[in-house]
Amino acid sequence: SERCDDWGLDTMRQIQVFEDEPARIKCPLFEHFLKFNYSTAHSAGLTLIWYWTRQDRDLEEPINFRLPENRISKEKDVLWFRPTLLNDTGNYTCMLRNTTYCSKVAFPLEVVQKDSCFNSPMKLPVHKLYIEYGIQRITCPNVDGYFPSSVKPTITWYMGCYKIQNFNNVIPEGMNLSFLIALISNNGNYTCVVTYPENGRTFHLTRTLTVKVVGSPKNAVPPVIHSPNDHVVYEKEPGEELLIPCTVYFSFLMDSRNEVWWTIDGKKPDDITIDVTINESISHSRTEDETRTQILSIKKVTSEDLKRSYVCHARSAKGEVAKAAKVKQKVPAPRYTVELACGFGAT
């Protein structure tokens, strides 16, 4: 019997498309699973077959390519919907095969509805703009391959529900939207609607993305440790709980990994025998600057623990810093009857 290499359901590719719009979906086999492309496969005599499984059942069926107006068609390794319908939602399978070879993968496709203000369950890509950084652009995404370069589509941009025209610092320029100087007030969802003709029909492509204005690299600084600092001394008696917060401010930096960690006597807490716990919390400013707090806690501190060196470290793409906490053992208050009496020369 025939074996088929089944890559299962590729949930990494959660494809979402809008109802009543064209959609072109590439077979993921050639992008993620196989080491050759469609052209090579085709010239080697392999055939690409498409199936789908309806949203509410488990049995796959061949895709019907004989629908009116060729609503669903295949071109090379691309499955085309012109346009989609709500009940096209389901799991799609592309299978590459000949008499001796077979490989297949399934992926989910969700056809979603949008309202007149482009609100929908669609997961939106986020585009970050630097605050007050000069001209920056966003581009209408995922429209390549829908129409030939000879076709000149019309593109309309919206912020939320409102068509962008005569905005102070936002200018539509075809497929691009330019921000002359990005401000916090530019945060929001931006939608481009691309309209193009094909075979006497008019199609619309709707693409929404979220713009988030973030801290500018011009203002970025290395991590700043606010705590521990030289003004606070952690003075404890043995048996008490020792709590030392390490609070670090990180400027927003694109793709930077912000790290905070404690060392005790130069070692990571995991590498030493004392019973220490560390709890972390993270907060963000409106421009995505980050404040991380790691609280080091020793439930019942010993006099040995109070002699150790506790250092908070922080690192970002801008640099690395460290700060030691001032920890000392509290000197017990003198007991009057004995110590003070002795001090006054009582016999």
């Epitope: 025939e2 088929c4 089944d6 077959i49 199936y51 309806r54 509410d56 059942r57 488990d58 049995l59 796959e60 069926e61 061949p62 399978t93 299978m95 095969r97 077979c102 297949k104």
Partner: antibody
Framework: SLEESGGRLVTPGTPLTLTCTVS????????MSWVRQAPGKGLEYIGV?????NLYYASWAKGRFTISKTSTTVDLKMTSLTTEDTATYFC??????????????WGQGTLVTVSA | AAVLTQTPSPVSAAVGGTVSISCQSS????????LSWFQQKPGQPPKLLIY???ILASGVPSRFSGSGSGTEFTLTISDVQSDDAATYYC???????????FGGGTEVVVK
């Protein structure tokens, strides 16, 4: 057309493979099913092999029955046969039309007799 | 697994008369209409009569009709002919294909 073969008299516990040979049917475009009928009894669903090769068995058939296919045949492999498995085994095309599946084309069946 | 329960056998019908056979599913069939009816004569494979609860299969006389939705279905044979003497089976398709099932069959005797 569909033609089943491989049915014969076997003793309990003997494995047996039945073959459904198809002609004029592209098995990459159709689901195929196996159904059996004990003498004087009703039809009983065994399972389906989907057009892309996915498998769907009746709960009672899981583990003992295995469906597979090549470009021109659909096989039913049976293990641990008992006298209860004595039946005529049919293969049927499980076709979808307007989103509705049905068994639209049947073979003549092949008789399996399990007897000590 | 789904269970399909048919009218107890046998059912008698006079030539020229009408006979109805019922089929009840323990759960709703897929799309509320994925139910088929088959005719089987001794020594022959089943023959498809109706699919989609009410769609007449190609080449089947219009004397046969199907109705129903969800879990309750009926096959009706009007102007019964002697050639209609056979056993009739319903078959259901479900969201989970493993639940597919056939009814126990109803024998129609023509007098």
């Amino acid at each position: 057309s569909l033609e089943e073969s491989g049915g014969r008299l076997v003793t309990p516990g003997t494995p047996l493979t039945l073959t459904c040979t198809v002609s004029g049917i592209d098995l990459s475009s159709y689901a195929m099913s196996w159904v059996r009928q004990a003498p004087g009894k009703g039809l009983e669903y065994i399972g389906v092999i989907g057009s892309s090769g996915n498998l769907y068995y009746a709960s009672w058939a899981k583990g003992r029955f295995t469906i597979s296919k090549t470009s021109t045949t659909v096989d039913l492999k049976m293990t641990s046969l008992t006298t209860e498995d004595t039946a005529t085994y049919f293969c049927a095309r499980y076709t979808i039309d307007s989103g509705i599946y049905t068994y639209d084309l049947w073979g003549q069946g092949t008789l399996v007799t399990v007897s000590a | 697994a789904a269970v399909l329960t048919q009218t107890p056998s046998p059912v008698s019908a006079a030539v020229g008369g009408t006979v109805s056979i019922s089929c009840q599913s323990s759960q709703s069939v897929y799309g509320n209409n994925e139910l088929s009816w088959f005719q089987q004569k001794p020594g022959q494979p089943p023959k498809l009569l109706i699919y989609g609860a009410s769609i007449l299969a190609s080449g089947v006389p219009s004397r046969f009709s199907g109705s129903g939705s969800g879990t309750e279905f009926t096959l009706t044979i009007s102007d019964v002919q002697s050639d209609d003497a056979a056993t009739y089976y319903c078959a259901g398709g479900y969201s989970s294909t493993s639940d597919n099932a056939f009814g126990g069959g109803t024998e129609v005797v023509v007098k």
